[in-house]
Structures are given as structure tokens and as C-alpha cells.
Interface confidence: low
Amino acid sequence: RKIPKVGHTFFQKPESCPPVPGGSMKLDIGIINENQRVSMSRNIESRSTSPWNYTVTWDPNRYPSEVVQAQCRNLGCINAQGKEDISMNSVPIQQETLVVRRKHQGCSVSFQLEKVLVTVGCTCVTPVIHHVQ
Amino acid sequence: GITIPRNPGCPNSEDKNFPRTVMVNLNIHNRNTNTNPKRSSDYYNRSTSPWNLHRNEDPERYPSVIWEAKCRHLGCINADGNVDYHMNSVPIQQEILVLRREPPHCPNSFRLEKILVSVGCTCVTPIVHHVA
């Protein structure tokens, strides 16, 4: 997918725009809001009826190099007695994010934007029953 | 992509840190298409902690459209289809990276921005945590 070159008058190119070679774009990877804090309820991954674990993937040629992925612990959901109820399903909730990929070609390096699908957590759903004809 | 010559003795240079500013190819490498979550999954309706999806649009950002989840209830839906207030629906939040046009309105100049999005909701027990 390409970043749309928006043609609205809103995007008339200002004089202050930096010159950019054709087919590329300038990207400042000093992150805006780098230090913002997530104020999610504590330990929801273990308190959920569809609990999940986290694993960290690390790649030095990716920015950011660390990406955290969630995996649902169960196929079913945890009921009030703390037992797995397989009449319900734990399912992953996913979100796309952008990363910058560094590629080495001989003694040169190039950078590529990449979309990564991150599993954020899990939720408990009623299963869809497929009737066999 | 756009190649950048590396320093002499390149095998060990530039491996640790990314430069502050890079030139990247306009094509975004990815097998996943950016889909409307309402079409890609009906979990938001079938969950015991269902949520609504709200469209957040910003032409100065890429992707310009992001969907935000809002839990429908304070409690969770029980087996009878009623809201059980002994359980809580809570949002699952995730920090994601997007591109912000910088300077504003420039077509090919961006800065990475971290934003916090609510992706969906999950049903939790209000368990106590002991503080030392």
C-alpha cells in the first residue's frame, strides 16, 4: 500500500516542506509522545475470563526493536468457578502498528516501513455454530 | 528502497542504533490490508464484554482512519444475556506507531507518533491486589 498523496487543497504543499527524492519520504523516528503512560487496569491479562500471556519479540533491524505479542492461554473461557468453559471461546484481539525495517544490501542500508499485526489481548465470545448441511 | 552508503568498515557500524532521520520507500511492506474491524471480525458484538467501534479520522496522520473501541457496559454479559455487575468490562489498550505529517500538510515528510488506542474490551474479575 502507498501513502496516499492527498490532492485536497488542504494539502497544497507549503514552501517549508523539505525536498524529498522521488519514490521516498523523509521520516523522523524521534517519536512524538514517547513517554506517555498507559493507564490500563492492572493485570487484566490474568484477571480476564479469557486470560493471555505476553511474549516479547526482538529484532535489532526493526524500530522499535521490541514488539510485545499476546497469546490466549485457553481455547475456552474461565467461568466463575475458575474452570475452563469450552462452550465459550477465548479469541485474540489484534491491532496493526507501523515499524521501520532496516535492510542491509552489501555495505549499504535502506529503510522500509512495514505494517505489523500485534495481538493485544483476548476476549471471551459466544461461538458461531456452523450447521453442516 | 533508498540506500544510504555506510561508513568504511561497515560490518560493525550502524548496527546498534537507528539514525534520527531516515529516508524510507513510499511503499509500505505488508501482507495485511488495513480493514475496517467491523467487517473483519464480529467479536465486538459476540464478546461477553461487547464494545462499539468509533471512527477517528485525521488527514494529517497515516493511517488517517483509526477505530477506537468503547465498552458498552460497566459489567459483562452473562449466559442469560443480562449484564452481570459482579464482573467488569474493561478496555484493552495498545500503544501503536503512526505517521504524523511534519511539517504539517507536507505530502512526503513524516514523524513517528505513538498513540494509545482502545482495541477491544475484555471481561475481568475485580480481584484484589495486596500492596506490600
Epitope: S41, R42 | K70, C71, P126, V128, H130
Partner: nanobody, 124 residues
Framework: DVQLVESGGGLVQPGGSLRLSCAAS????????MGWYRQAPGKQRELVAL???????DYADSVKGRFTISRDNSKNTVYLQMNSLRPEDTAVYYC??????????????????WGQGTLVTVSS
Amino acid sequence: DVQLVESGGGLVQPGGSLRLSCAASGTIVNIHVMGWYRQAPGKQRELVALIFSGGSADYADSVKGRFTISRDNSKNTVYLQMNSLRPEDTAVYYCAAEIGYYSGGTYYSSEAHWGQGTLVTVSS
């Protein structure tokens, strides 16, 4: 612990207005969601409106355009401005909040709390 205290209920004529308020007090660390539910005689408790920590709000379809929820974070208070009231709005209105709080050295990370309820009667 945490207490939710509602006020502002009463008798009002159809087409009239009321403003409910609900103040949360106690050893509160954070309030994730505050809002209002209502229960009419012989019916299930139902959502009226919720306001989230970021300020965005959700409303039941039956009250959209008539009711407005707002929140004063500095006072841990939520308000419900009810305009164009109808007889079917008659119910006990309960304040609700999902709150993280301390009690006796224990952090309760996310628990639903309820007020005692305030009666709203819409009748001529």
C-alpha cells in the same frame, strides 16, 4: 473505601429538565469510567450514559440528543443533564463507576461501584 453519592432527583413535568450529580469519594487512585444506569419498576437495570477517562461518552439510543453526561475530574464528580423528559424516563437512576482504589493496604485495581440511587419521576 469508595462511596458514590447521588443528588438531583425529583418530580418533574413532561418536557422539563433535571440535573443529576454523583460524587465519588474515598481512597481513589483512578476512575476509568463513570456513568448512569436506571431501573424502572419491574424492569431490568439499563445503561443511560457513560463517560470514559479520556472524556468521550456513550449514550443509550433512547436518551441521545436529550441527555448530556459530563465529568469534573478534579471533583471526581459526574453529571447528567436531562432535558425534554418523558414519562418513560421515570426510574431510579443509579450512579456507577469503575474505580481503582486503596483499602487497608490493598489495591483494588478495577471494581464496579454503585450509588444508592435517586428517584426521577416524570409526570403531569
